[in-house]
């Protein structure tokens, strides 16, 4: 992209290059042939995060507790507030405007990745040799009991939802 008539951090108005306002400040008046651009800081509840020529600052995001949100990082004059979800909840969308409870992994499935404030639980089917008999947002698939190591034999085979059942070996008389 070839360079434009005005340099970086400048804007063109009425055939003149004026300085943009720095992040955290809004435009009050454009420059003239004899005066510089006039900028003013955003108020406490507002921000602007780029070099700009905005005449109004943006309001900080409100983290609504009724939607399960809480403040993760307080906004400044240059940054917006970052919201996250309360414990046990995660963001419904990338913009995190509301939260929903983490899903549990049903029996036969284990937790592959525990949910965070911004991502839901990721479940995976228990592979052969593993099981989960609970509905849980935390529990991974557990390995079947090894009967051999207990000097026992398998009496009932395990499934993806149940452990094996071990029993004593039949003694030869």
């Amino acid at each position: 992209e070839p360079p434009t008539a005005c340099r970086e951090k400048q804007y063109l108005i009425n055939s003149q290059c004026c300085s943009l306002c720095q992040p955290g400040q809004k435009l009050v008046s454009d420059c003239t042939e004899f005066t510089e651009t006039e900028c003013l800081p955003c108020s406490e509840s507002e921000f602007l995060d780029t070099w700009n020529r905005e005449t109004r600052c943006h309001q900080h995001k409100y983290c609504d507790p009724n939607l399960g949100l809480r403040v993760q990082q307080k906004g400044t004059s240059e940054t917006d507030t970052i919201c996250t979800c309360e414990e046990g909840l995660h963001c419904m969308s990338e913009s995190c405007e509301s939260c929903v409870p983490h899903r549990s992994c049903l029996p036969g499935f284990g937790v592959k990745q525990i949910a965070t404030g911004v991502s839901d639980t990721i479940c995976e089917p228990c592979p052969v040799g593993f099981f989960s008999n609970v509905s849980s947002a935390f529990e991974k698939c557990r390995p079947w009991t090894s009967c051999e190591t207990k000097d026992l034999v398998v009496q009932q085979a395990g499934t993806n939802k149940t452990d094996v059942v071990c029993g004593p070996q039949d003694r030869q008389r």
């Epitope: 070839p2 434009t4 008539a5 063109l12 108005i13 009425n14 055939s15 290059c17």
Partner: antibody, heavy 116, light 107 residues
Framework: QVRLQQSGAELVRPGTSMRVSCKAS????????INWVKQRPGQGLEWIGI????????NYNENFKDKATLTADKSSNTAYMQLSSLTSEDSAVYFC?????????WGQGTLVTVSA | DIQMTQTTSSLSASLGDRVTISCRAS??????LNWYQQKPDGTVKLLIY???GLHSGVPSRFNGSGSGTDYSLTISNLEQEDIATYFC?????????FGGGTKLEIK
């Protein structure tokens, strides 16, 4: 005083290119932007583009992006507009104009006639 | 692009009259409306910049006003040397655009 002296009238053939010059005096050449404007009889004024003589940076009207090229020579305080692939539609008076405030100082205009 | 409209293409007035020429933009142009005078010999001069700023050397009988989308140029006490075509132009956003012009003639 501020003065923009443009090159003289030209008769050019269709399909060729030509260059209009605009020599600035009476002010710091690199401190002000230069605009170019086209005027055809009965068609009003059309802004072609704007040039920063200090940096060489430009902005063009989309309608002239493939038609006009704006440049400057700081050593001679001269701005140039190259017009390419000329057709009868390009027959017009072309003005160079120093910016700030607005289109503050105009050259006398250069009449370009495209004819076989 | 912003369209600039001068509804009156020609205007007749007598010397000494007060004349008003109007210009409308298709959207808000803040204050960035400029007025130009083109004499019959083709020379062009800036009269008013940014709605109401009188350019250096321009007589005080020229006055600009307006806001938003509606602007006007008033010439009080019309003189013979004011016979010309007057153009408005917006300098708010690219591409810069002009009105079609208003030709002022003497009755």
């Amino acid at each position: 005083q501020v003065r923009l002296q443009q090159s003289g009238a030209e008769l050019v053939r269709p399909g060729t290119s030509m260059r209009v010059s605009c020599k600035a005096s009476g002010y710091a050449f690199t401190n002000y932007l230069i605009n170019w404007v086209k005027q055809r009889p009965g068609q009003g004024l059309e802004w072609i583009g704007i040039l920063n003589p200090g940096s060489g940076g430009t902005n063009y009207n989309e309608n002239f992006k493939d038609k006009a090229t704006l440049t400057a020579d700081k050593s001679s305080n001269t701005a140039y507009m190259q017009l390419s692939s000329l057709t009868s539609e390009d027959s017009a008076v072309y003005f160079c104009i120093r910016g700030s405030p607005g289109f503050a100082y105009w050259g006398q205009g250069t009449l370009v006639t495209v004819s076989a | 692009d912003i369209q600039m409209t001068q509804t009156t293409s020609s205007l007749s007035a007598s010397l000494g009259d007060r004349v008003t020429i109007s210009c409308r933009a298709s959207q808000d142009i803040n204050i960035y409306l400029n007025w130009y005078q083109q004499k019959p010999d083709g020379t062009v001069k800036l009269l008013i910049y940014s709605t109401s700023g009188l350019h250096s050397g321009v007589p005080s009988r020229f006055n600009g006003s307006g806001s938003g989308t509606d602007y006007s140029l008033t010439i009080s006490n019309l003189e013979q040397e004011d016979i010309a075509t007057y153009f408005c132009q917006q300098g708010y956003t690219l591409p810069y655009t002009f009105g079609g012009g208003t030709k002022l003639e003497i009755k």
